[in-house]
């Protein structure tokens, strides 16, 4: 059969299963004159043979674990034994069968875990090896917990990563493990090959003893610190402790205060660094963080609460230099004249801010002293002895002492005696007629002037006029300002007029005094006036229901998914057409009728979130007026970025020859979102054979160490491939390359002879 089992001499690759006795020839090479015979060289291991006529075969079962690839060369010779064709490469790939069982590297493992450790964070790895090909199911290992002892309430506290053998706590384990209740656990772990999927898989078991240790990384009790402390600072106020020595502590001020008066030392002791002022800030909340030597957080931050205790360090303050009240001539005993309200910056509802009022002087003392009294705690002034007469004394001045438990302050009150309020305000017109305005009349515009007069004493509360709209303006679109000299009222627009909701408003004004009317006198129809406001329609732009619309979706939503919607209404009731503006990434489309927004392309949080576009609502018909609102699309992260090296690692070298195995540290990162504690990568070598020369070990969630397994390296560059898995959902893996050069060194640097190639590294390890 020409082609499959026979043919001319050319480079070829054959795949043969290991462990099988030879049952057929591999290939029959055909000689082209002047070639008459064939010769086989290379990695024959006395298994591969070629007969002179070109029949290539093997004479006993192959073993992939001894050699996975046999690189052979076949040459064609002429009658004189001279090579006339080739040699050509013939590659024999030995295909794996499951002829090796997995074995754990240790029959017993021991580890410890801290209570409340983060679920899913590995604290121990079990490791098994299988000589079979890891690229096939034969060498693919599957780890499982067979039993957990003790098992409380049938709840598993531990879990194992089926692929990596990483043991970690479950959510329940993180919450419930307590060394006071149960300080130790035992796990039986099994490992199977065939990915655990076959009845014919081989397996092994190991035992894991786990000690549970106490977690002392706990938030301390809230601290109370008295303000204005005169003790020498800094003063220790509390402490935190990481579970192991060597942590680096820091404080995080989430409030971004201009003055942050706390510090932490490397023992975890927390200090206040300067006196606090409760009146400036009465409580602080900040966070204590513990980090490892690489600056990575070791755990969640602890919340520290500091309450500032008040001392009486503020005197009462008067509301103004002089407080003016008015009292009518005929007012009766006990009538309220007004209330003096002093302030105290100390803590409310405590003795430090509780105020007492006392009249210390009245001038003049005519017709007698003690005409007024003040309520001790309320500060309300009352008429105490008799009605007052303006012609005798038109003005009194009171000095009032306001005190808290330590401080006294004097406040001054002027009491003006005014004529009795026996005249009501009278409008000069009872009806101000009709007024027609466009609905887009500017806010602040004066639209009408009204006037009432009052015959009481001028420039007193008895004659001062306040105008109120008591009917026809429930929305509060209008207001009235009074000129205190003329009592003229100016009707102004306070809120936009609206033809659609109030085309005609029948407005009623009331004119009244700030002082009460004397007994027996009442406001009547003369104190009321009306007018009619007619609002005309203006074609207005559509109005969005919100200034900013916000929606939240996962960055991996399918194209065509509805991601949000916007709504606008046209005041005139016209239909609206929606469109998008500023969709720079071309991610979105909007249904021009409904305002629903859909994705039209893959979204990417890492390109920027939130994604901000403008939505435009345009009238259909009419004058096509439009208005604009914002649509913010918040993209929630999915694990869609594989890990990569955090920086460029060209330039790593070891001085050749190595005197002892060496190592170097590298850092990984990825572009996905990570919670406070950062990524948790796992590291392994990128191909099975690299394990003969190299070893990779995890330092923490982002750093790993690449070490040489021996010292017998050539003086040359090696490119080491490393797999980095982010452990996400789904887990993503990146293969990165670390170029490492072994070179002759002079004074710790790579020696480069003149004219040597550029690019040889210059950073030693």
């Amino acid at each position: 059969q020409e082609g499959k089992f026979s043919g001319p001499l050319k480079p070829m690759t054959f795949s043969i299963y290991e462990g099988q006795e030879p049952s057929q020839i591999i290939f029959q090479f055909k000689a082209n004159p002047p070639a008459v015979t064939f010769e086989l060289t290379g990695e024959t291991d006395n298994i591969f043979v070629i007969e002179r006529e070109g029949l290539l075969y093997y004479n006993r079962a192959l073993d992939r674990e001894t050699r996975s690839t046999h690189n052979l060369q076949v040459a064609a010779l002429d009658a004189n034994g001279i090579i006339v064709e080739g040699p050509v490469p013939i590659t024999i790939k030995v295909k794996d069968i499951n002829d090796n069982r997995p074995t754990f590297l240790q029959s017993k493992y021991e580890g410890s875990v801290r209570q409340n450790s983060r679920p899913g964070k590995p604290f121990l790895y079990v490791n098994a090896t299988d000589l079979d090909d890891p690229a096939t199911p034969n060498g693919q290992l599957y780890y499982q917990i067979v039993i957990q002892l003790p098992m409380i309430n049938n709840v598993m506290y531990f879990q194992i990563n089926n692929k990596t053998g990483a043991i970690s706590l479950t959510r329940e384990g993180s919450q419930e493990l307590n060394p006071a209740k149960n300080p130790s656990y035992n796990l039986v772990i099994s490992v199977k090959d065939m990915g655990g999927q076959s009845e014919n898989s081989f397996s092994d078991t190991t035992s894991v003893d786990i000690i549970v240790t106490e977690n002392i990384w706990k938030a301390p009790k809230p601290v109370e610190m008295v303000e204005n402390s005169t003790d020498p600072h800094p003063i220790k106020i509390t402490q935190v402790r990481w579970n192991d020595p060597g942590a680096q502590y820091s404080l995080v001020d989430k409030e971004k205060l201009p003055r942050f008066p706390f510090s932490i030392d490397q023992e975890g002791d927390i200090y206040v660094t300067q006196p606090l002022d409760r009146e400036e800030k009465d409580a602080y909340v900040f966070y204590a963080v513990a980090k490892d030597e690489y600056g990575k957080p070791l755990s969640y931050p602890l919340e520290i609460h500091v309450k500032v205790k008040d001392i009486n360090d503020n005197p009462p303050t008067c509301p103004s230099p002089v407080t003016v009240f008015e009292v009518q001539e005929n007012e009766r005993l006990g009538n309220s004249i007004g209330t003096l309200t002093a302030h105290d910056r100390d803590e409310e509802n405590t003795a430090n801010s509780f105020l007492n009022y006392r009249i210390v002087e009245q001038t003049p003392k005519l017709p007698m002293d003690g005409l007024f009294l003040i309520q001790t705690y309320a500060g309300m002034l009352q008429l105490a002895k008799q009605s007052l007469k303006k012609q005798d004394t038109p003005q009194y001045n009171l000095t009032i002492e306001v005190s808290d438990k330590d401080f006294k302050t004097l406040c001054f009150v002027q009491i003006n005696v005014i004529d009795i309020n026996d005249q009501i305000p009278i409008f000069e017109k009872s009806d101000y007629g009709n007024l027609t305005l466009a609905e887009d009349t500017n806010i602040g515009s004066t639209i009408l002037t009204i006037q009432a007069t009052d015959a009481d004493e001028p420039f007193t509360g008895s004659s001062k006029i306040l105008y109120h709209i008591i009917k026809g303006d429930s929305e509060g679109r209008l207001g009235v300002d009074t000129d205190p000299h003329t009592n003229t009222g100016y009707v102004i627009i306070k809120k936009p007029l609206d033809f659609e909701t109030a085309a005609v408003s029948n407005i009623v004004f009331k004119a009244e005094n700030p002082e009460p009317l004397v007994f027996g006198v009442k406001y009547n129809a003369s104190s009321f006036a009306k007018f009619t406001l007619i609002v005309t329609d203006v074609n207005e732009a559509p109005q969005f229901s919100q200034h900013v619309f916000q929606a939240k979706v996962s960055e991996d939503v399918a194209i065509g998914t509805k991601v949000g919607n916007v709504t606008a209404k046209d005041p005139e009731g016209l239909d609206i057409s929606y469109s998008l503006r500023g969709d720079t990434r071309g991610w979105l489309k909007i249904d021009h009728v409904t305002g629903e927004i859909f994705s039209v392309a893959p979204l990417d949080r890492e390109a920027g979130s939130p994604y901000r576009v403008q939505v435009v609502a345009t009238e259909v018909g009419g004058s096509s007026l439009s208005s604009v609102s914002e649509f913010h699309l918040i993209l929630m992260d999915v694990n869609d970025n594989p890990p990569r090296l955090a920086k460029d690692y060209t330039g790593l070298f070891f001085c050749h020859p190595l005197s002892a195995p060496g190592s170097l540290i590298f850092e990984a990162t990825d572009d996905d979102q990570h919670l406070f504690r950062g990524p948790h990568f796992t590291f392994s070598l990128g191909s099975g054979s690299l394990q003969n020369d190299w070893e990779v070990s995890k330092i923490n969630g982002t750093h790993a160490r690449l070490s040489t397994r021996h010292t017998e390296f050539e003086e040359r560059e090696y490119v080491v491939l490393i797999r980095i898995n982010d452990g996400g959902r789904p887990p993503l893996e990146g293969i990165v390359s670390l170029p490492v050069t072994f070179c002759s060194c002079v004074e710790g640097s790579c020696f480069r002879p003149a004219g040597h190639q550029t690019g040889i590294p210059t950073v030693g390890m």
């Epitope: 690839t69 690189n71 990128g686 050539e714 090696y718 491939l721 990165v736 390359s737 170029p739």
Partner: nanobody
Framework: EVQLVESGGGLVQAGGSLRLSCAAS????????AGWFRQHPGKEREFVAA????????RYADSVKGRFTISRDNAKNMLYLQMNSLKPEDTAVYYC???????????????????WGQGTQVTVSS
Amino acid sequence: EVQLVESGGGLVQAGGSLRLSCAASGRTFSSPIAGWFRQHPGKEREFVAALISTGGSTRYADSVKGRFTISRDNAKNMLYLQMNSLKPEDTAVYYCVATGNTYRGAYDRPAEYDFWGQGTQVTVSS
């Protein structure tokens, strides 16, 4: 399993250019390191160029540096070798290669590559 098929070889005059292509089938061209070797008649296979896909960095034999450029198109599953300023000593069979599980770090050794194409003949006449 990866199958590699080279094309683009041929006869060219000294100083001329050729572009070799290598199509990967069987699975995506996911090998972290892919490259080109060549074999002169009666000689051992010799490293020409390698492309380390993880960082996009390249390595070249001193004899071809500045004249040859290796590149890949992941979307099309293709590896290329652009050969300029060709010399008669570049005459050889050129093989496309990709790493598998036997890779040990020495990217310029034939034994490091599990997957080989059948080769394409490049002849440079003077």
